[in-house]
Interface confidence: medium
């Protein structure tokens, strides 16, 4: 055999007697006719030797140690080679050792290619005899991270300050690659991080550093579990001991991405969480131990990953193939933070990719399922854009704003369904016609239905909210000048039962200049409350809105304003209101920035109320609330 080690390779090869056996005949290393029982070869040396027996593997072992110094120069990161190549080495049980020294601030990551690693406990051995022993260091103290076999879940181990990796290969094993690479990372600020990846159902047993001896005092160790979100993970502690703490408390912490209650803190004696969907981290935190009687902290635990138990595997089909410019998002509804552990709540696409949020887009059929203990923790928000790019093509076209039945059939509450209605600027306007007349939500007469329509401008620079409208009122139609968003917002689960009451048609109509026109046909004996858009913030500068109020022939309408003055103070221009009788065209004009608002007035015929704003000074906005009440005429004035 010839072993030649390149100069400055920092490799040392040691051939020595292994565990003594009861073999009668001794065996020696033969070098230059000398018989020796130990041979050390250093960098830059070339040695030719042989053995005095036919089966040296029964007598000798070989250790190949490579020292990697990351303190004084650049680190050779990347795939780690077996040097010298196993084909050049005598067929002895061999141990390759890589000793990497680095600064405390440098993180080192061992990345294991498939097959990943499986940790074994004391007294256990690996079926194929290939073992990986990994240790780290805290200052001058060596810390055993663990011993691992092949065919497991451990894919990466991150440490800092240094790492010692020993790969033991039996003499008969054909392996000629290390199976791992080294990468540098930023400081991990803990003893180590072990990543464990599950491709499907399975389990992994893992142990604290130095197990079964004590975990280093006041240290932190983290395990990161990568679990397909359509599966559930449960943690159980197989064996643990607590040390005697002087300060702080020994504990485990769970970090679940997407959870609102991170980190979840548990005592080691607590029942550990189960039925967790998707990825999670588990950390073991030590304490300051009593110097006289420290005791030991140690932990051996199992993670079991399996398909969800006692849960419906129902698949819901969401057919958006005939929709366009639409997206549907299922997401967690906002909740008040609680410190209590909450199992994951996930929505899955094709039962494969699961996450706490899922967005479905138009043009396809989607199959979804849920992994969630309580579906009321989720809600749906949908956005759909209806755009007309050419006025000649869509003038007078109509579009029904209906929530598709596929969406209503999902077991998750619909929160918002928003239609963005876009028209060519200065070419077309929009009219909204409800299936059932609408009531405007006001403090005086709030909506008490399970849903409302929120109507607002969809022009980015324009802050204009027309209001919230629900079925069961007197507003027959709403005309708006340009792009708007109409959002159907639900307020109660009973929306499912009331869904038939929804129904709004939008039509593209010839362009008009007013920001909005409300057509109101009041019902007898009901008081209709109406208010200017952007209530609480004030009608935008130089904006004009109108109400077209119908009065049946046998009725009289009482128009009442709810304050004496408008309160608006104009910086430039004038704010005014015109009340015009539609039959006679007779009109009254009121200067809103000067005059008092009119006293209650009676109208025997249909009339217009038009309000136009000036550019108000800040804080002196234009907000008006008025009501219309019909009563039967006592005298026929026609």
């Amino acid at each position: 055999f010839e072993i030649a080690l390149p100069r400055e390779s920092n490799i040392t090869v040691l051939i020595k007697l292994g565990t003594p056996t009861l073999l009668a005949k001794p065996c020696y290393i033969v070098i230059s006719k000398r018989h020796i029982t130990m041979l050390s070869i250093k960098s830059g040396e070339r040695i030719v030797f042989t053995f005095s027996c036919q089966s040296p593997e029964n007598h000798f072992v070989i250790e190949i140690q490579k020292n990697i110094d990351c303190m004084s120069g650049p680190c050779p990161f990347g795939e780690v080679q077996l040097q010298p190549s196993t084909s050049l080495l005598p067929t002895l049980n061999r141990t390759f050792i890589w000793d990497v020294k680095a600064h405390k601030s440098i993180g080192l990551e061992l990345q294991f290619s498939i097959p990943r690693l499986r940790q074994i406990g004391p007294g256990e051995s690996c079926p194929d005899g290939v073992t990986h022993s990994i240790s780290g260091r805290i200052d001058a103290t060596v810390v055993r991270i663990g011993t691992f076999c092949s065919n497991g879940t451990v894919s990466r181990i991150k440490m800092q300050e240094g790492v010692k990796m020993a790969l033991h290969l039996p003499w008969f094993h054909p392996r000629n690659v290390s199976g791992f690479s080294i990468a540098n990372r930023s400081s991990i600020k803990r003893l180590c991080i072990i990543e464990s990846v599950f491709e499907g159902e399975g389990s992994a047993t893992l142990m604290s550093a130095n197990y079964p001896e004590g975990f280093p005092e006041d240290e932190l160790m983290t395990w990161q579990f990568v679990v397909p979100a359509h599966l559930r993970a449960s943690v159980s502690f197989l064996n643990f001991n607590l040390s005697n703490c002087e300060r702080k408390e020994e504990r485990v912490e769970y970090y679940i991405p997407g959870s609102t209650t991170n980190p979840e803190v548990f005592k080691l004696e607590d029942k550990q969480p189960g039925n967790m969907a998707g990825n999670f981290n588990l950390s073991l935190q030590g304490c300051d131990q009593d110097a006289q009687s420290p005791g030991i902290l140690r932990l051996q635990f199992q993670v079991l990953v399996q398909h969800p138990q006692n849960e419906s595997n129902k698949i819901y089909v969401v057919d958006l193939s005939n929709e366009r410019a639409m997206s549907l998002t299922i997401e967690p509804r906002p909740v008040k933070q609680s410190r209590k552990f909450v199992p994951g709540c996930f929505v899955c696409l094709e039962s494969r990719t699961c996450s706490s949020n899922l967005t479905l887009t138009s043009g396809s059929k989607h199959k979804i399922s849920f992994l969630c203990d309580d579906l009321t923790r989720l809600w749906m928000n949908v956005e759909k854009t209806i755009s007309c790019t050419d006025h000649r093509y869509c003038q007078r076209k109509s579009y029904s704003l209906q929530v598709p039945s596929d969406i209503l059939h999902l077991p998750v509450e619909l929160h918002d369904f928003s239609w963005k209605l876009l028209v060519p600027k200065d070419r077309l306007s929009l009219v909204l016609v409800p299936a059932q007349k609408l009531q405007q939500h006001t403090h005086e007469k709030p909506c008490n239905t399970s849903f409302s329509y929120l109507v607002a401008s969809a022009i980015p620079s324009q802050d204009l909210y027309f209001g919230s409208f629900c079925p069961g009122g007197s507003i027959k139609q709403i005309q708006v000048k340009q792009n708007i968003s109409v959002t159907l917002r639900t307020f109660a689960p009973s929306f499912q039962q009331e869904a038939s009451r929804q129904g709004l048609t939008v039509s593209f109509i010839p362009y008009f200049k007013e920001e909005g026109v409300f057509t109101v046909t009041p019902d007898t004996k009901s008081k209709v409350y109406l208010r200017t858009p952007n209530w609480d913030r004030g009608l935008p500068s130089l904006t004009s809105v109108s109400w077209n109020i119908s009065v049946p022939r046998d009725q009289v309408a009482c128009l009442t304003f709810f304050k004496e003055r408008s309160g608006v103070v104009c910086q430039t221009g004038r704010a005014f209101m015109i009340i015009q009788e539609q039959r006679t065209r007779a009109e009254e004009i009121f200067s809103l920035d000067e005059d008092v608002l009119p006293k209650p007035s009676f109208h025997h015929h249909s009339f217009w109320v038009n309000i136009s704003n000036c550019s108000p000074t800040s804080g002196k906005q234009l907000d008006l609330l008025f009501s219309v009440t019909l009563t039967p005429r006592t005298v026929d004035l026609t």
Partner: antibody, heavy 119, light 107 residues
Framework: QVQLVQSGSELKKPGASVKVSCKAS????????MHWVRQAPGQGLEWMGW????????TYADDFKGRFVLSLDTSVSTAYLQISSLKAEDTAVYYC????????????WGQGTLVTVSS | EIVLTQSPATLSLSPGERATLSCRAS??????LHWYQQKPGQAPRLLIK???QSISGIPARFSGSGPGSDFTLTISSVEPEDFAVYYC?????????FGQGTKLEIK
């Protein structure tokens, strides 16, 4: 099933007129717009214009204003393309196609009518 | 007017290969773009609507990408019956224009 059946090939002299028909069946004509597309021999597709089947109002691309007229007879579910003062460069296959949506895609096409203009 | 430029003009492939056809619009047209296939002596056939939406009856090997101004029609594994001319069409605004076409031919 939905079908658009066009009239047969035409051979015309320069200066003459031609009227190509497109009969719709399997759906209600007035529910969808009707578009016309021209394809000269060995060339690509050119959109000529469309007719609003609800109102009968035609719209033409700039290159097809003047000699080209789109019309409709809803009683027989048929759309028409008439070309007057024919020129040699009008020789092409003319297709009618059904338009879907406000910004249309053409989901059904007629088989095409070859109009040849030659002296 | 939206100008659509298709590339390449001709694409020579063998059955089983992947075809990638490009269509570039002179300005952003969102997803207002459709793809058609035309075989000699036949009318065009709608393959993809609104840049990426599939059409019932069209094999799943046809897919499209968008929105914006750069669009792609992909045939994952070309079948013998796919050799034809492919056109993209803008439906953004009048006039509704077509690209000049890409001829997919057998290598």
């Amino acid at each position: 099933q939905v079908q658009l059946v066009q009239s047969g090939s035409e051979l015309k002299k320069p200066g003459a007129s031609v009227k190509v028909s497109c009969k719709a069946s399997g759906y209600t004509l007035t529910d969808f717009s009707m578009h016309w597309v021209r394809q000269a021999p060995g060339q690509g597709l050119e959109w000529m214009g469309w007719i609003n089947t609800e109102t009968g109002a035609p719209t033409y691309a700039d290159d097809f204003k003047g000699r080209f007229v789109l019309s409709l007879d809803t009683s027989v579910s048929t759309a028409y393309l008439q070309i007057s003062s024919l020129k040699a460069e009008d020789t092409a296959v003319y297709y009618c196609s059904r338009g879907r949506d406000y910004d249309p895609h053409f989901d059904y096409w007629g088989q095409g009518t070859l109009v040849t203009v030659s002296s | 007017e939206i100008v659509l430029t298709q590339s390449p003009a001709t694409l020579s492939l063998s059955p089983g290969e992947r075809a990638t056809l490009s269509c570039r619009a002179s300005q952003s047209i969102s997803d207002f773009l459709h793809w058609y296939q035309q075989k000699p002596g036949q009318a065009p056939r709608l393959l993809i609507k609104y840049a990426s939406q599939s059409i019932s009856g069209i094999p799943a090997r046809f897919s499209g990408s968008g929105p914006g101004s750069d669009f792609t029609l992909t045939i994952s594994s070309v079948e013998p019956e796919d050799f034809a001319v492919y056109y993209c069409q803008s439906a953004h605004s009048f006039p509704y224009t077509f690209g000049q076409g890409t001829k997919l031919e057998i290598k």
